[in-house]
């Protein structure tokens, strides 16, 4: 009976474990007449014997690091020593036993990272070797942090990937490393082999010494520039610098101007393009950016602030064409009679502003000149020599110059004499009755028509009625306007009216004139009037604290988490019931009572944030009036979506037979945000049994290579495996298929036989 | 054109004060930085601190913190290095020099003040 | 004792070639892309030859040029002239707002 260790002379593979002392025979080659004896040539290295019956063996133990196959032949000879059959190729795999230990290639190693550097991004590699077999768990080296020196609040700042040994920032490294505070740290990496998984895995250590560098991409100082400048633009006013050469540099308008007149250049500099104009705009705030060459933005951008400094470029201007002011006759020395208020559009509190008064010239000249003075700063005008007789002159026309250090500006003023006021206003009526009237009339209506009179002369300050509620409204919820031909009053509603505050209000009016009265007369009782307000109850809804409530919660939160609160109150002073409208996905639950919000289900940002929903108080009892405001619900990222690809790839071939390597590109993409700086995906293939064949190579945060390495690939449908890993925390990995077809090609694109239509790629490579 | 223009040549003896200046004209004074440097005899140059008197936002090197003290009147494009007690070590030309924001390099130069400093 | 190393001297004939090589660390020189060199003739203010690594200011012949290489910047004159006789000062930015001078070369044109 030929069994499993005997047989024919035939080609044959054996697998042998290395490193274990010989317990049994290989094989029993039986020989067929007429071979009597058998010969054993090749890589035998003294360990292989065959004896002349057949009997294979070897006589001490193997070492797969020395040699990891042994190519061995095996021929039957006869009496004479003839060879009649064979030589037949005898193969010897040695299988890997872990009997070596990983050993890293430097003992130390320096490399330097820089300060808010993207986490995951790797800045130095460690380097460990196995002499074991890498296809088997024995040579698969696992990389870790043993510690970090100094560990500041037990925040790991560096973090390894365990296959690779790239070591780059954690979130928190990037955030928080300062060199300033610590410029230098120490790393203790071990690696072990058995992928790091087994109590009898061996290991090996190396120490990492790290200088944080600062980030130089920071915001420049205020930079200050004068407006209407002569001289040639572009003017550089100030530089950015991205850490390292390459960047491309933009500006951004947050202000979205007409007119931006700032560039940048690709060394950073950024220039004025035109002279400004403080008057238009005294200051500006934009934004410089640094983007990668695929036109991602490498970091934050930074904010620019120009201030333009003012210079005297604007006249005084008057604030009309001709100021008209009153006087009455018997006005004493030294009384006020108007202020000219002239304007200049430089800066404020400035010389370049600041303004002189004086008179140049008085028309007529009756009974003298100098009637008047001006103060010289305060532009107010006041009588100087004697009272004024309007049957004399009534009227006075001033011209009067307004100047800053470098212009002067005519400004005219026409004085009018008027009676005296010596007669006060009187109201028609002084008490107006009881007016009701319902909280929510309409703001803006008029609620009373009140009437004074005054026998001064007419069309002056002096008979002019303003009418002020001196008593009774000190919400300020009535005014009253007056008609300026007939001295009318119309009582207007100012704010809304409300009976739980004020059900009964006592208004009292007074008239008064804008001219002061003449010495000796005073207002009396005939100058004031009253009404009274009373307001009727009208059952109102719930009032909202806010129109918007908003909360920020993340999207991991647990069920049950209180999410936000909102807040309303009845004017009546009722109880409310508070319930939630339109949450249409079922995520949360409103406390009737207290109007806590509470999440109910899980919540995901990538289904869209914020969440709004609308939120309903409603009185408990009464009439159930209600009233709905807005809640919304942002909701912050975690990273919980795995990378994917960002397009259908299916269709993708190469025309078979390959004349050279080829590639494809593809491109990947998550759900999760990325703020500036935009995904920064690593890629890798899904399989070891990939390597052959493929292999994949990062172009940018979100493309990669798909690449051929050779051109010995058979006709038909390749599935091809690729790892994208996102780098998040946690870092999520993704598993996507690229279907890669390799077929022949007429004029470029696949060709199938007539009938033969499925699946038919598109898009060659 | 750009000019920085530093006070004459001063004696002084330990003990004493000293304010020396450094005027700047032929561009907009505020928008940059002034530096200090100190030469001292047979030596080389060493980066004493700056200021930017847009704001007076001072910063000095580690090894003058203390020693000196740099101001700016931005009203009248001028700097200032000032000494309270001065010592015979600070005998030395000292140097004003435009320094440019976010690229630290220097680039024009006042024509230097020589302080001597007996004991 | 100055952060940056230079060596004191070096020469070279009208014509030849120099250069100067300023040594830092990776928290210098290694570590920013803002190394400048400066010629200073004795008496005078100094002069900026090179900033940011390897740029020339206008009216800076390009006889001058600069590379940096790890943590080791360094000066190339080309032509010698006797003109370019002077003492050159490398510098760097060290971090954390503060500015480093080398000890300075003395160019010597034979």
């Known amino acids: 009976q030929e069994g499993k260790f005997s047989g024919p002379l035939k080609p044959m593979t054996f697998s042998i474990y290395e490193g274990q002392e010989p317990s049994q025979i290989i094989f029993q080659f039986k020989a067929n007449p007429p071979a009597v004896t058998f010969e054993l040539t090749g890589e035998t290295d003294n360990i292989f014997v065959i004896e002349r019956e057949g009997l294979l063996y070897y006589n001490r133990a193997l070492d797969r690091e020395t040699r990891s196959t042994h190519n061995l032949q095996v021929a039957a000879l006869d009496a004479n020593g003839i060879i009649v059959e064979g030589p037949v190729p005898i193969t010897i795999k040695v299988k890997d036993i872990n009997d070596n230990r990983p050993t890293f290639l430097q003992s130390k190693y320096e490399g330097s990272v820089r300060q808010n550097s993207r986490p995951g991004k790797p800045f130095l590699y460690v380097n460990a070797t196995d002499l074991d077999d890498p296809a088997t768990p024995n040579g698969q080296l696992y990389y870790q942090i043993v510690i970090q020196l100094p560990m500041i609040n037990n925040v790991m700042y560096f973090q390894i990937n365990n296959k690779t040994g790239a070591i780059s920032l954690t979130r928190e490294g990037s955030q928080e490393l300062n060199p300033a505070k610590n410029p230098s740290y120490n790393l203790v990496i071990s690696v072990k082999d058995m992928g790091g998984q087994s109590e009898n895995s061996f290991s090996d250590t190396t120490s990492v010494d790290i200088i944080v560098t600062e980030n130089i991409w920071k915001a420049p100082k205020p930079v200050e520039m004068v407006e209407n400048s002569t001289d040639p633009h572009p003017i550089k006013i100030t530089q950015v610098r991205w850490n390292d050469p390459g960047a491309q540099y933009s500006l951004v308008d947050k202000e979205k101007l007409p007119r931006f007149p700032f560039s940048i250049d690709q060394e950073g500099d950024i220039y004025v393009t035109q002279p400004l104009d403080r008057e238009e705009k005294d200051a500006y705030v934009f934004y410089a950016v640094a983007k990668d060459e695929y036109g991602k933005p490498l970091s934050y951008p930074l904010e620019i602030h120009v201030k333009v400094k003012d210079i005297n470029d604007n006249p005084p201007t008057c604030p009309s064409p001709v100021t008209v002011f009153e006087v009455q006759e018997n006005e004493r020395l030294g009384n006020s009679i108007g202020t000219l208020t002239a304007h200049d559009r430089d800066e404020e509190n400035t010389a370049n502003s600041f303004l002189n008064y004086r008179i140049v010239e008085q028309t007529p000249k009756l009974p003298m000149d100098g009637l008047f003075l001006i103060q010289t700063y305060a532009g107010m005008l006041q009588l100087a020599k004697q009272s004024l007789k309007k049957q004399d002159t009534p009227q006075y026309n001033l011209t009067i110059e307004v100047s800053d250090k470098d212009f002067k500006t005519l400004c005219f003023v026409q004085i009018n004499v008027i009676d005296i006021n010596d007669q006060i206003p009187i109201f028609e009526k002084s008490d107006y009755g009881n007016l009701t009237l319902a909280e929510d009339t309409n703001i803006g209506s008029t609620i009373l028509t009140i009437q004074a009179t005054d026998a001064d002369e007419p069309f002056t300050g002096s008979s002019k009625i303003l009418y002020h509620i001196i008593k009774g409204d000190s919400e300020g919820r009535l005014g009253v306007d007056t008609d300026p031909h007939t001295n009318t009053g119309y009582v207007i509603i100012k704010k809304p009216l409300d009976f739980e505050t004020a059900a009964v209000s006592n208004i009292v009016f007074k008239a008064e004139n804008p001219e002061p009265l003449v010495f000796g007369v005073k207002y009396n009782a005939s100058s004031f009037a009253k009404f009274t307000l009373i307001v009727t109850d009208v059952n109102e809804a719930p009032q909202f604290s806010q129109h918007v409530f908003q909360a920020k919660v993340s999207e991991d939160v647990a069920i049950g988490t209180k999410v936000g609160n909102v807040t309303a109150k009845d004017p009546e002073g009722l109880d409310i019931s508070y319930s939630l409208r339109g949450d249409t996905r079922g995520w949360l639950k409103i406390d009737h009572v207290t109007g806590e919000i509470f999440s109910v289900a899980p919540l995901d940002r990538e289904a869209g944030s914020p969440y709004r929903v609308q939120v309903v108080a409603t009185e408990v009892g009464g009439s159930s009036l209600s009233s709905v405001s807005e809640f919304h619900l942002i909701l912050m990222d975690v990273n919980d979506n795995p990378p994917r690809l960002a397009k259908d790839y299916t269709g993708l071939f190469f025309c078979h037979p390959l004349s050279a390597p080829g590639s494809l590109i593809f491109e990947a993409t998550d759900d999760d945000q990325h703020l500036f700086r935009g995904p920064h995906f690593t890629f890798s293939l899904g399989s070891g049994s990939l390597q052959n064949d493929w292999e994949v190579s990062k172009i940018n945060g979100t493309h990669a290579r798909l690449s051929t390495r050779h051109t010995e690939f058979e006709e038909r449908e390749y599935v091809v495996l690729i790892r994208i890993n996102d780098g998040g925390r946690p870092p999520l990995e993704g598993i996507v298929s690229l279907p890669v077809t390799f077929c022949s090609c007429v004029e470029g694109s696949c060709f199938r036989p007539a009938g033969h239509q499925t699946g038919i790629p598109t898009v060659g490579m | 054109q750009v000019q920085l223009v530093q006070s004459g040549a001063e004696v002084r003896k330990s003990g004493e004060s000293l304010k020396i200046s450094c005027e700047g004209s032929?561009?907009?004074?505020?928008?940059?930085?002034i530096a200090w440097v100190r030469q001292m005899p047979g030596k080389g140059l060493e980066w004493m601190g700056i200021i930017y008197p847009g704001d007076s936002d001072t910063r000095y090197s580690p090894s003058f913190q203390g020693q000196v003290t740099i101001s700016a009147d931005k009203s009248i494009s001028t700097a200032y290095l000032q000494w309270n007690t001065l010592k015979a070590s600070d005998t030395a030309m000292y140097f004003c020099a435009r320094h440019v924001d976010s690229t630290w390099y220097i680039d024009h130069w006042g024509q230097g003040t020589l302080v001597t400093v007996s004991s | 004792q100055p952060v940056l190393t230079q060596p004191p001297s070096a020469s070279g004939s009208p014509g030849q070639s120099v250069t100067i090589s300023c040594t830092g660390t990776?928290?210098?020189?290694?570590?920013?892309?803002?190394v400048s060199w400066y010629q200073h003739h004795p008496g005078k203010a100094p002069k900026l030859m090179i900033y940011?690594?390897?740029k020339r200011p206008s009216g800076v012949p390009d006889r001058f040029s600069a590379s940096k290489s790890g943590n080791t910047a360094s000066l190339t004159v080309s032509g010698l002239q006797a003109d370019d006789e002077a003492d050159y000062y490398c510098?760097?930015?060290?971090?954390?707002?503060?500015?480093?001078f080398g000890g300075g070369t003395k160019l010597t044109v034979l």
């Open positions: 032929g561009y907009s004074f505020g928008n940059y930085w």
């Open positions: 990776s928290s210098d020189v290694g570590g920013y892309n803002f």
């Open positions: 940011e690594v390897s």
């Open positions: 510098s760097s930015y060290a971090g954390n707002d503060n500015l480093q």
